[in-house]
């Protein structure tokens, strides 16, 4: 798993960054866990990063992710309800220069090294549909969320609002 110090070292550099001309409104480091309190961890294997969903041993350090929050204007002609709306979007970076990406073709969530401006696949619309949990909807594929499948992160299609509360797309953020 990544050491936390490496992430913290580069948060200051990110504060000065501009992604597609927009700066994040706020950033912070948090560990990511599932609704059932399994941890999201990241490991370097064969020169690429793997993402796991697992139970941590007692006193094992949780991996931290840098969440950068962006405000996105949604014009009224797109919103369908006659008002300009704002959404919160996030990018998630567990280590320097690597971001979570939605691979819509493979229905997978991957870590990619990339330079700014980040592609749309790295942006996720933030939902809090459940008390103190969040969900991440693909910017590039509305209705598709980051979810848990077979101890990995995957992209999961949510076909109705009733399923927005399904546990496998709910995540907890913790700064401890």
């Amino acid at each position: 798993a990544f050491g936390i110090s490496g992430v913290q070292k580069y948060t200051r550099a990110l504060h000065d960054s501009s992604i597609t001309g927009i700066s994040p409104i706020t950033e912070y480091l948090a560990s990511l866990s599932t609704y059932n309190d399994q941890s999201i961890t990241f490991a370097l294997e064969d020169e690429s990063y793997e993402i796991y969903v697992e139970d941590l041993k007692k006193d094992e350090k949780k991996d931290k992710v840098l969440l950068s929050y962006y405000e996105s204007q949604h014009p009224s002609n797109e919103s369908g309800d006659g008002v300009d709306g704002k959404m919160l979007m996030v990018t998630l970076s567990p280590t320097k220069d690597f971001w979570l990406h939605a691979n819509n073709k493979e229905h997978s969530v991957e870590l990619h090294k990339c330079e700014k401006p980040l592609p749309d696949q790295a942006f996720f619309v933030l939902h809090n549909m459940h008390s103190n949990c969040v969900s991440f909807e693909c910017k590039t594929d509305p209705g598709v969320f980051i979810g848990v499948k077979d101890n990995h992160l995957a992209l999961i299609k949510v076909d109705s609002s009733e399923n927005l509360c399904t546990e496998n797309i709910l995540f907890k953020l913790s700064e401890t």
Epitope: I25, T26, Y28, G85, M87, V125, L126, N128, M129, H130
Partner: antibody
Framework: QVHLKESGPGLVAPSQSLSITCNVS????????VHWIRQTPGRGLDWLGV???????SYNSALMSRLSISEDISKSQVFLKMNDLQTDDSAIYFC???????????????WGQGTLVTVSA | DIQMTQSPASQSASLGESVTITCLAS??????LAWYRQQPGKSPQLLIY???RLADGVPSRFSGSGSGTKFSFKINNLQAEDFVIYYC?????????FGGGTRLEM
């Protein structure tokens, strides 16, 4: 134009229940959460609960056993029901809309005018 | 529940002056803090969200700062309509708690 308006009974007898309707216009309940808040001179502003975009509901745990929030999307209405009212439930009850689509992190951008509820025999 | 401690409870100031109100959260809330003002007989009005962002139509003499547990709200060049009550609110986790309010008096 975003608009929220509460309508309530005004006077409620102790141990009876309270029903308030929040009529909304200018936005979609499928995109924005609607919150219920009450205000008393003694306690200030108290958050009661939220009907989130997508229909899920969160309550203030201190009042959860007495509260029920629901909606009629076709009529653009959100409802608050509170049981077993006591005199200290006398307050101005507000509904308010989230600032952001799909999340409450940005606070409440639009509020109704409030409806005064007095609990008295 | 997260407690929000707002201070001072009341403050006197004069037209054209600046004032600062602080809000302390009992645990870290990131940047998820909003500031409202409430005129007598009216509902609260959102001024600042995400700790530092100015809500639509709010004059730039209002500003917010802070993150984590300590937040500040400043009004420059006080106008007559600013002498009302101000509230902070945390939106990090439910229940979304408010501060006790600050009454600004002339």
């Amino acid at each position: 134009q975003v608009h929220l308006k509460e309508s309530g009974p005004g006077l409620v007898a102790p141990s009876q229940s309270l029903s308030i309707t929040c009529n909304v216009s200018g936005f979609s309940l499928s995109k924005y959460g609607v919150h219920w808040i009450r205000q008393t001179p003694g306690r200030g502003l108290d958050w009661l609960g939220v009907l989130r975009a997508g229909g899920t509901i969160s309550y203030n745990s201190a009042l959860m056993s007495r509260l029920s929030i629901s909606e009629d999307i076709s009529k653009s209405q959100v409802f608050l029901k509170m049981n077993d009212l006591q005199t200290d439930d006398s307050a101005i009850y507000f509904c308010a809309r989230d600032h952001y689509y799909y999340s409450s992190f940005g606070g409440f951008a639009s509020w109704g005018q409030g409806t005064l509820v007095t609990v008295s025999a | 529940d997260i407690q929000m401690t707002q201070s001072p409870a009341s403050q006197s100031a004069s037209l054209g002056e600046s004032v600062t109100i602080t809000c302390l959260a009992s645990q870290t809330i990131g940047a998820w803090l909003a500031w409202y003002r409430q005129q007598p007989g009216k509902s609260p009005q959102l001024l600042i969200y995400a700790a530092t962002r100015l809500a639509d139509g709010v004059p730039s003499r209002f500003s917010g700062s802070g993150s984590g547990t300590k937040f500040s709200f400043k009004i420059n060049n006080l106008q007559a309509e600013d002498f009302v009550i101000y509230y902070c609110q945390q939106l990090n986790s439910t229940p979304y708690t408010f501060g006790g309010g600050t009454r600004l008096e002339m």
